[in-house]
């Protein structure tokens, strides 16, 4: 039979304080039968860290189920590492006996405990907000020691001052966490903006860690609506255009209504981006004037990003000029360009041109 070898593949393992350390160990044979024990250090003063056969080791978990058939993986995971756990760990195979007899040791794995902060994770608001509103961004970093740490916020490279930071716990601990919340006022130009959380710590040798978040995930820029009539064509058809401009995100549905009845519904897709990250979209409707005896009330209804619809109405005066007419001639343009999402009831907004 091939002679059993105990393999500890890593000479060293480095782990942040408070995290778990995995110490790998495999045997090359099922033979001989007998348990594995893990020790820290060598010689008579070595410390038993884990025994497969007996004992209570609350911080140590075998990576593989010891009862798994034909198990030759004797790796362990030590939870909640502290600087006191540093040292060299040995995986030792025993031969079954009365008592079990030490047979072979692995080469050892040196565990070093570092206390570097984790990469900052920046999270934004759960729902989008519009310009002029204030939104909160949170930055978190964990696992560092000592407790002293510096955190800064930037928006597009400019340092922010409106933030609150807490380092926990307040008392002594093997590792610490930092959580900071910054308040950012949105502007309509913020689609391409970015907030940065920067963490500086003694373990980082002057090279701070950064976490970023894009304001595009937090902002909603509502559209402007403008409805205009082009010159009447020779075939008595009027081309009415609804221009939807400066909106973000792209998710937008436009519905044309003729005298309150749905004429057409369109979804915005694959629109070119403006320099500021917003989108524009133009939709038009051809109205056959000769088919109508009375004025035609056209409504461009826009539902943006799941918000309440915004309406812009336009009346084509059929009786006034049965022949060709210029843009906006003998027409009533009703609506509003207000940018908040209230129901835009035409009865409340009459603008005669």
């Amino acid at each position: 039979e091939e002679e059993l070898q105990v393999i500890q593949p890593e000479k060293s393992v480095s782990v942040a304080a408070g995290e778990s350390a995995t110490l790998n160990c495999t045997a090359t044979s099922l033979i001989p039968v007998g348990p594995i024990q893990w020790f820290r250090g060598v010689g008579p003063g070595r410390e038993l860290i884990y025994s497969q056969k007996e004992g209570h080791f609350p911080r140590v978990t075998p990576v593989s189920d010891p009862t798994k058939r034909n198990n030759m993986d004797f790796s362990i995971r030590i939870s909640n590492i502290t600087p006191a756990d540093a040292g060299t760990y040995y995986c030792v195979k025993f031969r079954k006996g009365s008592p079990d007899v030490e047979l072979k040791s692995g080469a050892g794995t040196e565990l070093s405990v570092r206390a570097k902060p984790s990469a900052p994770v920046v999270s934004g608001p759960a729902v989008r907000a519009t310009a002029e509103h204030t939104v909160s961004f949170t930055c978190e970093s964990h696992g560092f020691s000592p407790r002293d740490i510096t955190l800064k916020w930037f928006k597009n490279g400019n340092e922010l001052s409106d933030f609150q930071t807490n380092v926990d716990p307040a008392g002594k601990s093997v590792s610490y966490s930092i959580r900071s919340t910054a308040r950012v006022v949105l502007t309509r130009r913020d689609v391409h903006s970015q907030v940065i959380c920067e963490v500086a710590h003694v373990t980082l040798q002057g090279d701070p860690l950064r976490g970023t978040a894009n304001l595009s995930e937090a902002i909603r820029v509502p559209p402007f609506l403008e409805v205009t009539q082009q010159s009447m064509r020779a075939d008595n058809q009027v081309n009415v255009t609804c221009q939807v401009t400066k909106f973000y995100p792209q998710r937008l549905q436009l519905t044309w209504l003729e005298n309150g009845n749905v004429s057409r519904t369109e979804m915005a897709s694959a629109l070119p981006e403006n320099k500021d990250g917003t989108y524009n979209w133009t939709s038009w409707l051809l109205v056959n004037v000769s088919a109508h005896r009375d004025d035609v009330k056209l409504t461009c209804q826009v539902e943006h990003d799941g918000q309440p619809a915004v309406n812009k109405s336009f009346s084509v005066k059929v009786s006034a000029h049965p022949k060709e007419q210029g843009s906006n001639t003998a027409a009533e343009n009703t609506g509003t360009n207000e940018r908040d999402y209230k129901d835009d009831d035409d009865k409340h907004h009459h603008h005669h041109h």
Epitope: I31, E54, G55, T67, K68, N70
Partner: antibody, heavy 119, light 110 residues
Framework: QVQLVQSGAEVKKPGASVKVSCKAS????????INWVRQAPGQGLEWIAM????????HYNQIFKDRATLTTDTSTSTAYMELRSLRSDDTAVYYC????????????WGRGTLVTVSS | DIVLTQSPDSLAVSLGERATINCRAS??????????IFWYQQKPGQPPKLLIY???NLDSGVPDRFSGSGSGTDFTLTISSLQAEDVAVYYC????????FGQGTKLEIK
């Protein structure tokens, strides 16, 4: 030192049930399978079933699947084997045995529990 | 299920002589380079005792006059020089699948 101490002898009537216990010591109970084996008088060994105390995973001999139930109590490191609907041919010594190498073998044995089924 | 058949059913051997017990499996008990055969010794009034694991490996504390050999479907337990304390019933067991035992071989002194 691994020890498996079994409960005392039982006399049961046909149709009754019996529950044999096996208390383990000298090792981490949840790290090793426990097997149950029986031996009728003057007969050979017959494997009944096995249980992993860490998660109560069990494997049964098809012959006993409908009548035997293995359980464990990890707080007391005790394994149990219950056999229902006893017949006279269930009269046997019932052994628990620990699998030290996870090879589905029987490295350490209890001393056995004699179950007699008689009307 | 794998069926194990031991031969002979009983065996009488003189003290100091070699005793050989065979165990044949109804299909191969080999897997991943190991032969999943185990040999047990049972003396009257005692539980069985593991002698050999994985076909050829002597268990802890077992005298080296005991040995196991074989692969695939045919296996042998050998006692090189029979001692009086070796009188017992010997069982083979497989665990390539779920455990099954052979019917046993009774070893006596001639």
């Amino acid at each position: 030192q691994v020890q498996l101490v079994q409960s005392g002898a039982e006399v049961k009537k046909p149709g009754a049930s019996v529950k044999v216990s096996c208390k383990a010591s000298g090792y981490t109970f949840t790290n090793y399978w426990i097997n149950w084996v029986r031996q009728a008088p003057g007969q050979g060994l017959e494997w009944i079933a096995m249980i992993d105390p860490s998660d109560s995973e069990t494997h049964y001999n098809q012959i006993f699947k409908d009548r035997a139930t293995l359980t464990t109590d990890t707080s007391t490191s005790t394994a149990y084997m219950e056999l229902r609907s006893l017949r006279s041919d269930d009269t046997a010594v019932y052994y628990c045995a620990m699998d030290y190498g996870s090879l589905y073998a029987m490295d350490y044995w209890g001393r056995g529990t004699l179950v007699t089924v008689s009307s | 299920d794998i069926v194990l058949t031991q031969s002979p059913d009983s065996l009488a051997v003189s003290l100091g002589e070699r005793a050989t017990i065979n165990c044949r499996a109804s299909k191969s008990v080999s897997s991943s380079g190991y032969n999943y055969i185990f040999w047990y010794q049972q003396k009257p009034g005692q539980p069985p005792k593991l002698l050999i694991y994985l076909a050829s490996n002597l268990d802890s504390g077992v005298p080296d006059r005991f040995s196991g050999s074989g692969s695939g479907t045919d296996f042998t337990l050998t006692i090189s020089s029979l001692q009086a304390e070796d009188v017992a019933v010997y069982y083979c067991q497989e665990s390539r699948e779920l455990p099954t035992f052979g019917q046993g071989t009774k070893l006596e002194i001639k």
